[in-house]
Each structure stands twice: as C-alpha cells, then as structure tokens.
C-alpha cells in the first residue's frame, strides 16, 4: 500500500510566438482543474481505458480574469498535492497522465463551458521511496511543470512497497528466515528509522539508529543466521500452523547492501542501488569526493573536493544510478512502430524495420502513399499496404480527381433540407421529422422509434453529427 | 462507442415527482460529461441538467431550478434526474446524452453532446 503524488509547480504559455497569453477565453474569468490518471505498464493504453491503478482530482483554482494591458501572470493554480492511493504493490513501470480543464465562471448561452486545455501522457520507471521526480511537459501551446514521487504508507517498505515492517513490539515468534504472515496485527505501526544497512527482515529498533536482531539471527546489522529456531517443535510439522512464512533463500535475503543501500535482485544475483556517497558492488566504499572519479560510463561528476562534501554524477544518455553504473533499457519504451525490432547499440537506438516499413522508428510505410498524390488538397492516408486519399469536401474518387456533391444524391428523407458541410453533409429536417437523415416521423404523441443516435434539430439548425 | 438507456418515464399529475434513470455502457471513461435534455412536440431540444462526472458540478436550466435534481452512481455507471413538483410545461421527451471533451462543452447545449439515449416519456397533466 502507498500513495503516489503529484505537485504541479506551474502550468501556463509555452515558449514560442503561437503561444496564448491566458487559459480564459474572452468570455470572462475561468478556474483551471487538474486531474490525474495513473495506468500500470508502459505499453501504449487507450486513452479511454480505466486509470487501473487510481485517479485524483485537484481541488479548483483560484478565479483567474485576465487583464488586457497586463503582462500574462503566473496562473493561479489549485493548492496542495494531488495524491493517488494505491491498495497493492507499486508496479515501477506505470503511465502518467495529466489532464488540465478550464471552467468558465461567466453566464453564457448553452450553460458554463467546460474545455480539456491539455493532456500530457509520460510513461515512466520510479521506484517507491526515491527521490521527488521533476518533469516539464508541453502539450500543445501550454507548458505543465510537475514533480511526482510514489511512497509506501501504513506499513509497507520496499521498492514495491510489498514487504511489510515490523512491530515496534518485536521480537516476533517466528525463527530464522521466517516472519509473521500478513496481515499484521492492528497493533503494529511503522517502525523508526534503524542503523543503516540493518536488515529489513531481521531486524528492527525501538529507538532510531539502533539494530536489534529477531530470534534466530545475529550480528551489527542481524545478517547472520544464528542456530536457534522459535518456529520448530510446535504444534504440526507444517509451518503453517504456527503463523509463520518460509520465504525461499533470495539473492537480496539478509540485504547484502550496505550504508542503506537498497536490493533488488536480478536473476540469480542482486543489485544493490547505493545512495549519493557510496559506491561499489555492495555500497561498500565511502567517503567518495569526485577526485576518486566516481562516475562510471563518461558522466560527469560534480561536487568538492573535500571528504565532506557529496558528488553528484551527471550522466550521459543511455546510463542511470548514482554512479552512472545502470545502462537504461531505452527498448523497454518501445520506440519502434509497425513491429521493428529495437537495438540498443549504447551510442544509439536502432530499429530494424519489417519489410515494407522504412524510417529510424519504422513509421513510414513504404508501401503505401511513396510517390502516390491525391488531387485537389486530399491527403493521402497509409494503412494496410494500399493507400487512400481522404478528400477535400466536395471531391471525391479514388485519386479525389472527380466532383462530388454530398447533396446529390437528395439524402435528406421527407423534405430534409440539404447543407455540404465540411465534414460531409448535415440534414434540417422538416417539422414532425427527426433523425440524422429525417428518416423518423415524430409521432403526436411526442413518442419516436429512433435508434441510439440523437434526434433531428429543428428546421434551420443543422445537426453536428453524421 | 458509448450506449445510453432512459428508463423511469411515465404520466404524472401535476405537482407529482418521478426519477429518470440512465445506464450507460461501453467507453464510460471517456464520459467526461452527461445530461439530460427535453424536446417537446414542435419544440426544440433544451438542456434541462447536466453533470460533470468527475468533480461532482452540476448545471441547471433556469426552468427547473429548486425542483430537479441530477446526481449519478459511478458504480452503477448511472445518472438519475429526480423531478418534483412537476409541471405540465415539463411533459416532453427526456434524453439522456454523453459527452467527452477536447474543446468546448458547454453543459446544456445539446449541439455539443456526442452520445444520445433513445428517450423517455414524460407527460404531466393538469
């Protein structure tokens, strides 16, 4: 269990002449919203698709009205975070999305108007725990700065927030190698913080800074095993009975990393994720200033030069971690379109492209529109190895070489009036006649037989769908 | 595709109530907006109440303020007007209708509503 947040820090113009001086149209003042979906994975969602793993609402922002002469202010936005509980495991990969709505606060025809000023989408990696991620985002003429971090709650720790802390009332009954089957009692409440490196499985702390073992092991950091054994000469051979789990030796049981350095484990091995400070295959080496070039993979290293003070490595593309020590799996994003193969040559992504599809993502099909043009201001639309011409109004044809007239073809029923719209045609149905072609009567009654489409305007009011 | 059905039409007497319900399925996430509307014989369609599903705001018509009522269920994936003290000039066809939003959705403008039930009954007589 944990809560992920999201801080907006501004949301305003983007740079570049195109850009709006104000989020309010020129009806009058407006209030912005901002609302947060999170999808698991980093595949590419449906933007209609659930926000599995939750959603969250700002709170509304304060009224904006712009002032003509004024030079555009910063806009007044919703106080506080924005904050998605989640109930199970954090999934690590997940996709973001930002939605910025615009309320109009003045009286107007048709009622207040709502409008989605902008929507960014990010897919992204973040471990549980870390550090506050900073991220700026431009969608359309708008520009969106945000942090967001995700946190374990209750008593969850971890990466995923899957392990589950210790009672303060510790020691537990359980042996060694074995902990107390969720869920904890009501009793247990988050435990302080212990001496770095103390193992989160073995060992626990009444005050902050000490490491105090479980039965059943021992050691400064409670990493090693001791003989002894609570869970064994109860009732029943299983383990079961006794209220007690045996997790199977794992590469990051016991936590091999030190000076708080957190495990995750890789097949067959472990990987040790160091703070700033630290280095080495199990966060074992310190008091690192940027003079013992700690830096791996040509990044750049940046602090004093005295034993105090820390380093931070800027990393080039391709490469993460403290110590620039983690290659990004940049393929993971799936950057190649139409099913080309990703190849990360460390310099550089390449895609292999299947046959037929050409470009450095793979999103030009060959096959279709090269050398192929559609007359009289038609595009020409890809897909399926054949192209298409989607035409301007009022052409049509394979090539939109030949004149069309939506209305030739007198497809408004029961005396319909006609109109070419530019985007197909529109039918201004005859009184007693409604439907998207007046095909249905109205009866006396005020009662019609009409499909799941809406009804037919009155004369003189053209529908806006098709 | 979103689809819309009305139920909970009828005759009523005038200074009566009833509760019109609307279940919609499909792509319901999209539905950022859902309303009912009214068109009466020879009338055009009107925006009686619309919600905005995910922040709880709600639009009246000046016609029935203080006497309608909309809210929703989002388990359910329904929306509910509650009529009282019903009108005759209230008899007319109710339609319950969706929209998502890229531009400009303004809450009683049946023009910018994209998905439409078949419509409900309602007649009050004096």
């Known amino acids: 269990a944990g809560v992920f947040e999201l801080q907006i820090h501004s949301f305003g113009p983007g740079p570049g002449p195109g850009a709006p001086r104000s989020p309010c149209s020129a009806r009058g003042p407006c209030r912005l919203f901002f609302r947060v979906c999170l999808k698991p994975g980093l595949s590419e969602e449906a933007a209609e698709s659930p926000c599995a793993l939750g959603a969250a609402l700002s709170a509304r922002g304060p009224v904006y009205t712009e002032q003509p002469e004024a030079p555009a202010p910063d806009l007044p936005l919703p106080n506080g975070l924005l904050q998605v509980p989640f109930r199970d495991a954090w999934p690590g990969t997940f996709s973001l999305i930002i939605e910025t709505w615009r309320e109009e606060l003045g009286d107007q025809i048709g009622g207040p108007a709502w409008s989605l000023l902008a929507r960014v989408t990010r897919r992204r990696r973040l471990a549980a725990g870390g550090p506050w991620a900073r991220d700026i985002q431009r969608a359309g003429a708008w520009e969106l700065r945000f942090s967001y971090r995700a946190r374990c709650e209750l008593l969850a720790v971890g990466t995923a927030c899957t392990r589950l802390c210790r009672p303060r009332s510790a020691p537990s009954r359980c042996g060694p190698g074995l902990r107390p089957c969720a869920p904890l009692e009501d009793e247990c409440e988050a435990p302080p913080v212990c001496r770095a490196g103390c193992s989160l499985e073995h060992g626990f702390c009444e005050q902050p800074g000490e490491c105090r073992c479980l039965e059943g092991w021992t050691g400064p950091l409670c990493t090693v095993p001791a003989s002894t054994s609570s869970c064994l000469g109860l009732r029943g051979p299983s383990s079961a009975t006794t209220g007690c789990l045996v997790p199977g030796p794992g590469p990051c049981d016991g936590n091999p990393c030190a000076n708080g350095g957190s495990c995750s484990e890789t097949p067959g091995s472990f990987e040790c994720t160091c703070p700033r400070g630290f280095y080495g295959l199990r966060c074992e080496v310190s008091g690192v200033t940027c003079a013992d070039g700690p830096c791996f993979n040509g990044g750049l290293c940046v602090g004093g030069a005295d034993p105090d003070s820390a380093y931070i490595c800027h990393c080039p593309p391709g490469f993460q971690g403290s110590n620039c020590e983690k290659r990004v799996d940049r393929c993971s994003l799936q950057p190649c379109r139409n099913g080309g193969l990703c190849l990360d040559l460390g310099h550089a992504l390449r895609c292999r492209c299947r046959a037929g599809f050409a470009g450095p993502r793979c999103e030009h099909n060959l096959d279709d529109c090269a050398g192929r043009a559609c007359a009289n201001g038609g595009t020409c639309v890809e897909g399926g190895g054949a192209h298409r011409c989607s035409c301007a109004l009022g052409f049509g044809g394979r090539d939109c070489r030949e004149r069309a007239d939506p209305c030739a073809a007198r497809p408004c029923a029961h005396g319909g009036r006609c109109y070419a719209h530019f985007s197909g045609l529109v039918c201004a149905c005859a009184p007693g006649y409604m439907g998207s072609r007046c095909e249905f009567p109205v009866h006396p009654d005020g009662v019609s037989a009409l499909p799941a489409a809406p009804p037919g305007l009155r004369p003189g009011d053209p529908q806006r769908y098709l | 595709q979103v689809r819309l059905v009305e139920s909970g039409g009828g005759s009523v007497q005038a200074g009566g109530s009833l509760r019109l319900s609307c279940a919609a399925s499909g792509s319901t996430y999209s539905t950022n907006f859902m309303g009912w509307f009214r068109q009466a014989p020879g009338k055009e369609r009107e925006g009686v109440a619309t919600l905005v599903t995910w922040v709880e705001r709600t639009a009246y018509a000046d016609s029935v303020k203080g006497r309608f009522t909309i809210s929703q269920d989002r388990a359910k994936n329904t929306v509910y007007l509650q009529m009282n003290s019903l009108k005759p000039e209230d008899t007319a066809m109710y339609y319950c209708?969706?929209?998502?939003?890229?531009?400009?959705?303004?809450?009683?403008?049946?023009?910018?509503?994209?998905?439409w039930g078949q419509g409900t009954q309602v007649t009050v007589s004096s």
């Open positions: 209708a969706a929209a998502a939003a890229s531009t400009d959705v303004r809450l009683l403008d049946p023009g910018d509503f994209a998905y």
